[in-house]
């Protein structure tokens, strides 16, 4: 299809080389009228539609994204060629930063319902650059935490080094929906609830004498509880002896509950004590079996292919640790009688 009639928008993604971050493009088609996407007579190619990335229309989730190769080759279907780019309804998610993401992205409705809809498309020229200015060393992270029940704020990473007075007008989105009230470089939350969690996008316009473009940043916001003040507790095994049958396989499970920590480095290990010999068994890996806002339950098993006489004199010790402290539980195997 002919993309010369598409409305054009220029975006800049300045990514930090120090952290992982994502990026999104919204399919900013104009508001549909009478279930149509748009009509040519409602929009000249020079006009930029208002930001309505998710308009509640079922139709609009059915858009097609393309990338325009720089060498003039035909448009490429994003889904087929770019595994690190995911389409979710109207939004294009870039999972990894990099200058190779620079280029022209075109979106248009999949279903063309009238001849006027042919020109109903948006072309986004995305420029991706690594952050070079070291002047702002403490710029806001692309992953921000809000403490439940307290006050907090979400900062726009690309503007976090500027004072509120200097800051340009910012357009904010949360999970793709426009937050029309928010216009500053910081969203202040009076009391944090779990619904404040989500993907926030902040946009502002930057201009020079030739053109203007939108600078965009994406912030993943997580609502959290305060760090635990307790060391982990072992839920299983409870008993310090376990009746077993010789020659039979055996799995001993260690389940431990770890309270929430912002910097979470849980340790769960099995040690074996045999006379003066003590060593760690680290296979298989630990796995999380339950995760809530307040805590996480992690399990690690030790697998004995068959219980031998030697195992009866060994102590199997589960060791768990967080930043507060550690807990151990040892198990001695006992042969089942009769």
């Amino acid at each position: 299809f002919n993309i010369s009639g598409c409305s054009t928008k220029k975006l800049l993604w300045t990514y930090s080389t120090r952290s992982e971050e994502e990026f999104v493009l919204f399919c900013d088609l104009p508001e549909p009228q009478k279930s149509h996407f748009c009509h040519r007579n409602r929009l000249s190619p020079k006009q930029v539609p208002e930001h309505l990335p998710f308009m509640g229309s079922n139709d609009l989730s059915d858009v097609q994204w393309y990338q325009q190769p720089s060498n003039g080759d035909p448009l490429e279907d994003i889904r087929k060629s770019y595994p690190h780019i995911i389409q979710d309804k109207c939004t294009l998610h870039f999972l990894t930063p990099g200058v190779n993401n620079s280029g022209s992205y075109i979106c248009r409705p999949k279903m063309i319902k009238s001849p006027y809809d042919v020109a109903c498309c948006v072309k986004m020229i995305l420029e991706v650059k690594p952050q070079t200015n070291a002047s702002c060393e403490y710029s806001a992270s692309h992953k921000q935490d809000l403490l439940l029940g307290s006050t907090g704020s979400i900062s726009c990473p690309s503007l976090s080094c500027q004072s509120d007075a200097q800051s340009p007008a910012v357009t904010w989105y949360k999970n793709g929906k426009l937050l029309s009230v928010e216009r500053s470089n910081r969203i202040v939350v009076d009391e944090v609830y779990d619904y404040h969690q989500g993907t926030y996008v902040c946009d502002y316009t930057q201009s020079d004498t030739v053109s203007s473009w939108t600078v965009r940043a994406v912030v993943q916001v997580r609502t959290i509880v305060g760090d635990t003040k307790l060391k982990p507790d072992i839920l299983d095994p409870v008993e310090d002896t376990l009746e077993v049958e010789l020659g039979k396989p055996l799995t001993i499970s260690c389940k431990a509950r770890f309270g929430f920590e912002r910097v979470f480095n849980p340790v769960i290990k099995w040690y074996i004590k045999d006379s003066d010999l003590e060593w760690e068994v680290s296979v298989p890996e630990a796995k999380s079996i339950k995760s809530t806002l307040k805590d996480e339950i992690i399990e690690r098993n030790i697998i004995l292919e068959k219980v031998t006489q030697r195992d009866l004199r060994r102590k199997f010790v589960c060791f768990v640790q967080n930043s507060i402290g550690n807990t151990t539980q040892s198990v001695q195997l006992k042969e089942k009688r009769g």
Partner: antibody, heavy 121, light 111 residues
């Protein structure tokens, strides 16, 4: 794989370090052991270094040998060789005690080709 | 210290025949025993562990048995390639015993 090196002719009393280089597996998951064999004689167990880095020695070898490890190597130091230490020294991987993989019965499942040490004046 | 006594020191049999090697531990090692085959100029090769479990890739002609202090390696349908020295090894770690004691070895000659 497992490969020993460092074997050579030494004079009695001259310390000698043999190196066992491993590839394809991690020393943080396995215990490694040293075994020697004097010419025309049987196998003699020297000592073991387990995944956590602790070492254990045969009663006759204590004080005469030191085992240590780095990320991909296990060293055996013969502190003060005598002519009785002339032998081929083998390094072997232990599946069992001191390894991350719990097994019902231990075994030495992977051996190097050995390195010859000759102690002579 | 734990002592492993292997008998006989040498055994000879014809191709297709059977040989039996015995290994006695000075204390109960609860089936924690491995058997190895060694050919001249080569490292030992694991055959059997846990007294009777066959290492993968080892022919079923090699059979281990025994318990407590008495263990046996039986090689049936003898082949020329079986000519080697065979060692038993205790793998029963004990604070009062040497960790992994080997037997003295048995030379198998195939006629």
């Amino acid at each position: 794989s497992v490969e020993e090196s460092g074997g050579r002719l030494v004079t009695p009393g001259t310390p000698l370090t043999l190196t066992c280089t491993v590839s394809g597996f991690s020393l943080s998951n396995y215990a490694m052991t040293w075994v020697r064999q004097a010419p025309g004689k049987g196998l003699e167990w020297i000592g073991i270094i387990i995944n956590t880095g602790y070492t254990y020695y045969a009663s006759w070898a204590k004080g005469r040998f030191t085992i240590s490890k780095a990320s991909t190597t296990v060293d055996l130091k013969i502190t003060s060789p005598t002519t009785e230490d002339t032998a081929t020294y083998f390094c072997a991987r232990v599946l069992g005690a001191g390894s991350s993989y719990y097994t019902s019965y231990d075994r030495l499942d992977l051996w190097g080709q050995g390195t010859l040490v000759t102690v002579s004046s | 210290a734990l002592v492993m006594t292997q008998t006989p020191s040498s055994v000879s049999a014809a191709v297709g025949g059977t040989v039996t090697i015995n290994c006695q531990a000075s204390q109960n090692i609860y089936s924690n025993l491995a058997w190895y085959q060694q050919k001249p100029g080569q490292p030992p090769k694991l055959l059997i562990y846990g007294a009777s479990d066959l290492e993968s890739g080892v022919p079923s002609r090699f059979k281990g048995s025994g318990s407590g202090t008495e263990y046996t390696l039986t090689i049936s349908d003898l082949e020329c390639d079986d000519a080697a020295t065979y060692y038993c090894q205790s793998t029963y770690y004990n604070i009062s015993a040497d960790f992994y004691a080997f037997g003295g070895g048995t030379e198998v000659v195939v006629k």
